[in-house]
């Protein structure tokens, strides 16, 4: 019903998200040289971060390196860091893949393994795979409420995706509940043909597209959102190109008057909300 | 080869960045009343923050105020805060440039210098210049990998800037390696005619533009990114207008059950990634 | 004076904001069972976060739950969590509104109130209203400097909203000072017909629109910003749909080698800066 000669206006949009859910996490710790499982509960403040813009992030997996301090220590053993004598190490060298600056000495890492010594945050983070299954695998049951207020300033018209009378215990479904603004994370992945549990291991980027199809004429007035989903990261990436989505962050603290940190390599899903559409009017 | 009557489509884009590099930082401490340099190593978790959207940030310089707690103390001496008697201070006054609320008393700061007393996080942050050279001056050797997946939904066409077979030890060069998605920070600045070491002192904003020039016709198909760079902040700013790019953040901790904080004024480069382009098709 | 046959170019924009101001906050604490008011001073590092993109956030209110640790404890009493026997609780159940995982036991919360026991960060956050008036109600006197550099790449033309000779002690006023880039937060709300003190309680989202009206022809050259404001969140939201703007974050620390956290529910204003406009040229 939109006419070609209608005036089309871009949309001004504001997005606010609320993630809900808790996850039971089974972490492996070492106590007196024995591996042991401890249970923790992760809530919103633990797994999501106050994000800006049209994005939110949910942590699905992690690797921790506890009790790091600035000192000298051997590099974690890899093909690049193993050595047999000081000749294999170069004082002042910073390997782009390394986490420290070489002292020029080749020292014992463990047993008969020797690696180049570095000045760094020690002990050095291990080079290891993300846990399988993902520690917050149950995040697929988390839900996100998306509040989207839009504005066609040229038409002086404002609306929003949550209208009075909405049953807020709803969950979005493409056919049975296409206007519900509460999305189960696992369902979003099902819609794009992806498996949440697989993506949760390494992380990824998921697009939530909100298309506003609006005819602002009095006679044919309609203006409501259509939700669709699109996997935005690359599913099949060479391991050397950092597949998935992860970043490192540190929790700093003082112990015995010395600054220490816990380094956390966080894997998770970044959800990008893309709002577009036009408002046509004579 | 693009025809005027081709259908042009806007691009949907997703960006993910990975910064690599370590910096040796020489911090000044006071030992026995004598200033002394100590070395620290800064890695990704120390100098960059998990960013959303199409931005990433690299810290290049900083000023620290350690051991602050909420109490009464004299303001840091400046023309605005010096006083000779209580008449020069106003109880309850909050100067926009100040960091505390005046008590109305004029007290000794040091020697014969007197300033207005305030309730604040004390000791008050000093009004001082950013260190020269920048403490993380060596950040110019850091590299950033930019992963950009794009989508022309109207044409049901998806591609990305990293194609199979890419040599990931490459570094971008305008003529010799224009498709390499790994950028040395110093090179980006060289491209815009700026000197990284200068900008690193006060910080700045740098644009990385990715222009997708795509013809999606079967016959003339081409679709690849062109990278260009643009300094986005203002190089020549009046000092009163906060040149560069900086912000303050705090690390909170408890000591003897009292909340304390380390205040850090962080200077650095915010990189904004701007993705644009159109896909033409009959 | 713009001609229809001028070539119109979109704008590339970079935004940098600086918030200034301090707030005196009166927090209620309980000491030996007695409620007591303590005064604190909040400065930029306490109430704002280093934000990316075209957004900044100012905390205006908060609720704290101190000394949480992972253990078993009774849920906070609400209609959903009250119980009279273990039959009212279900082992392993995670209520989406809850903060923990039920153990299956019904235990005493206080007096004769019993609730389902959970494994969680304990003590559980209370379900309570945001403080009235807002704890950082005085944030309406904070100011924000907005630096906006723009670029019409097609015309090779760059400008910015802060020109030499600007009196930087100015404050924006729609008629008396429409080019001043320093905005008092309370004034922004007055412009949109909102009351800062009301919005500060629950938080909200405010749009700052910068429209660049530019004619880049030599003869009719003009290019300057017009500032306008638009409330972006929904003023009249059903309480079940999370009115306002808030998020939770945690400050983690160690006590006697046990990880603890202070949970903070932060309410505040997110300011979204929307830059648009076109540059016309023959």
């Amino acid at each position: 019903s939109d006419k070609l000669y209608q005036r089309k206006e871009p949309v001004i949009s504001s997005v606010h998200t609320k993630v809900k859910g808790i996850a039971e996490v089974k972490e492996e710790i070492v106590e007196n040289g024995v591996k042991k499982l401890v249970h923790s509960v992760f809530d919103t403040a633990d797994y999501t971060f106050p994000l800006q813009g049209n994005s939110f992030f949910v942590m699905t997996n992690f690797l921790k390196t506890e009790g790091q301090e600035q000192r000298l220590c051997p590099e974690y053993p890899t093909r690049r860091t193993l050595c047999s004598s000081d000749r294999g190490c170069k004082k002042g060298w910073m390997d782009p893949q390394s986490k420290g600056i070489q002292t020029g000495r080749c020292v014992v890492y463990e047993g008969n393994q020797k690696t180049c010594e570095v000045s760094a945050w020690c002990p050095i983070e291990a080079v290891e795979e993300a846990p399988r299954p993902a520690l917050l695998n149950s995040a697929e049951n988390f839900t996100v409420l998306i509040k989207n207020n839009i504005d066609f300033p040229g038409h002086n018209y404002t609306t929003r995706n949550i209208l009075p009378g909405l049953n807020i215990t709803c969950t979005f479904h493409k056919t049975q509940n296409p206007q519900c603004p509460i999305f189960r994370l696992g369902d979003i992945f099902r819609e794009t043909g992806d498996n949440f549990s697989d993506v949760a291991i390494q992380g990824g980027i998921m697009g939530i597209e909100i298309y506003w199809d609006c005819n602002l004429d009095r006679w044919f007035h309609h203006c409501h959102p259509k939700y669709s989903f699109r996997r935005l990261d690359d599913k099949t990436t060479n391991v050397s190109l950092y597949p998935g989505y992860n970043f490192r962050y540190a929790k700093y603290y003082k112990e015995n008057n010395v600054e220490k940190r816990t380094l956390i390599k966080v894997f998770g899903i970044r959800f990008d909300i893309l709002v577009f559409g036009t408002g046509g009017k004579f | 080869s693009d025809k005027l009557y081709q259908r042009k489509e806007p691009v949907i884009s997703s960006v993910h960045t990975k910064v690599k590099g370590i910096a040796e930082v020489k911090e000044e401490i006071v030992e026995n009343g004598v200033k002394k340099l100590v070395h620290s190593v800064f890695d990704t978790a120390d100098y960059t923050f998990p960013l959303q959207g199409n931005s990433f940030f690299v810290m290049t310089n900083f000023l620290k105020t350690e051991g602050q707690e909420q109490r009464l103390c004299p303001e840091y001496p400046t023309r605005r805060t010096l006083c000779s008697s209580d008449r020069g201070c106003k109880k309850g006054w909050m100067d926009p440039q100040s960091k505390g609320i005046q008590t109305g008393r004029c007290v000794v700061y040091e020697g014969n210098q007197k300033t207005c007393e305030v309730s604040a996080w004390c000791p008050i942050e000093a009004v001082e210049e950013a260190p020269r050279p920048a403490l993380l001056n060596s950040a110019e050797n850091f590299t950033v990998l930019i992963k950009n997946n794009i989508d022309f939904p109207g044409h049901n066409y998806t591609t990305r800037n990293i194609l199979p077979g890419l040599n990931i030890t490459c570094t971008f060069h305008k003529t010799q390696n224009p498709q390499c998605p790994i950028f040395r920070l110093g090179d980006i600045f060289r491209e815009t005619g700026d000197n990284f070491s200068d900008v690193a002192i006060q910080g700045g904003i740098m644009g990385i533009e990715i222009y997708w020039d795509c013809n999606l016709d079967r016959w003339f198909h081409h679709c690849h990114p062109k990278y260009s760079f643009r300094r986005l902040d203002d190089k020549t700013t009046n000092v009163s207008l906060y040149p560069g790019y900086n912000f303050r953040y705090a690390k909170y901790y408890k000591e003897n059950n009292v909340e304390k904080r380390t205040l850090i004024k962080v200077f650095g480069i915010r990189f904004d990634i701007l993705v644009f382009g159109t896909g033409g098709k009959f | 004076s713009d001609k229809l046959y001028q070539r119109k170019e979109p704008v590339i924009s970079s935004v940098h904001t600086k918030v200034k101001g301090i707030a005196e906050v009166k927090e209620e604490i309980v000491e030996n069972g007695v409620k007591k008011l303590v005064h604190s001073v909040f400065d930029t590092a306490d109430y704002t976060f280093p934000l990316q993109g075209n957004s900044f956030f100012v905390m205006t209110n908060f609720l704290k739950t101190e000394g949480q640790e992972q253990r078993l404890c009774p849920e906070y009493p609400t209609r959903r969590t009250l119980c009279s026997s273990d039959r009212g609780c279900k082992k392993g159940w995670m209520d989406p509104q809850s903060k923990g995982i039920q153990t299956g036991r019904c235990v005493v919360y206080e007096g004769n109130q019993k609730t389902c026991e959970v494994s969680a960060w304990c003590p559980i956050e209370a379900v309570e209203e945001a403080p009235r008036p807002a704890l950082l109600n005085s944030a309406e006197n904070f100011t924000v400097l907005i630096k906006n550099n723009i670029d019409f790449p097609g015309h090779n033309y760059t400008t910015r909203n802060i020109l030499p000779g600007l009196n930087i002690t100015c404050t924006f006023h729609k008629t008396q000072n429409p080019q001043c880039p320093i905005f008092r937060l309370g004034d922004i709300f007055r412009e949109t017909g909102d009351n800062f003190s009301d919005v500060a309680i629950q938080g909200g989202i405010m749009g700052i629109e910068i429209y660049w009206d530019c004619n880049l022809d030599r003869w009719f050259h003009h290019c300057h910003p017009k500032y306008s404001f638009r409330r972006l969140d929904d003023k009249t939201t059903n309480v079940s749909l999370y009115p306002g703007y808030n998020f939770r974050y945690a400050k983690y620390y160690k006590e006697n080698n046990v990880e603890k956290r202070t949970l903070i529910k932060v309410f505040g204003i997110r300011f979204d800066i929307l830059v648009f406009g076109t540059g016309g040229k023959f």
Epitope: G67, E69, Q70, R71, L72, C73, T103, R105, S119, C122, P123, E255, N256, N257, V258, K260 | I29, V30, E31, N32, K36, V38, H39, V41 | -
Partner: nanobody, 118 residues
Framework: EVQLVESGGGLVQPGGSLTLSCAAS????????MSWHRQAPGKQRTLVAD???????EYEDSVKGRFTISRDNFKNTMTLHMNSLKPEDTAVYFC????????????WGQGTQVTVSS
């Protein structure tokens, strides 16, 4: 002026215990790795135990399980608890300090004599 002062040495019987202390002044103690070294008559000085500012410890093989090094960064002190002492532990024990990223020590104490004999 930098000073490292050792105390606690003395005569002890085999199987006995002793605690050595080292008090530091004039250095930013929490930036220094501290160590104990020993020198038996007519022999080279050797490393016994080392502790980083944050408490990471390393021991020479012959003392593992018998000696414990610790430090207090508020009091600027370091201690060495020595148990199950043997005659071959007899030596002058030196306290040393090195900046956390240095390979060799910057400062040394004067030493304290430990004699293990029946």
């Amino acid at each position: 002026e930098v000073q490292l002062v050792e105390s606690g040495g003395g005569l002890v019987q085999p199987g006995g215990s002793l605690t050595l202390s080292c008090a530091a002044s004039g250095i930013a103690f929490n930036y220094y790795s501290m160590s104990w070294h020993r020198q038996a008559p007519g022999k080279q000085r050797t490393l016994v135990a080392d502790i980083s500012p944050g408490g990471h410890t390393e021991y020479e093989d012959s003392v593992k399980g018998r000696f414990t090094i610790s430090r207090d960064n508020f009091k600027n002190t370091m201690t060495l608890h020595m148990n199950s002492l043997k005659p071959e532990d007899t030596a002058v024990y030196f306290c040393a300090a090195r900046l956390r990223f240095e390979v060799s020590s910057n400062y040394w104490g004067q030493g304290t004599q430990v004699t293990v004999s029946s």
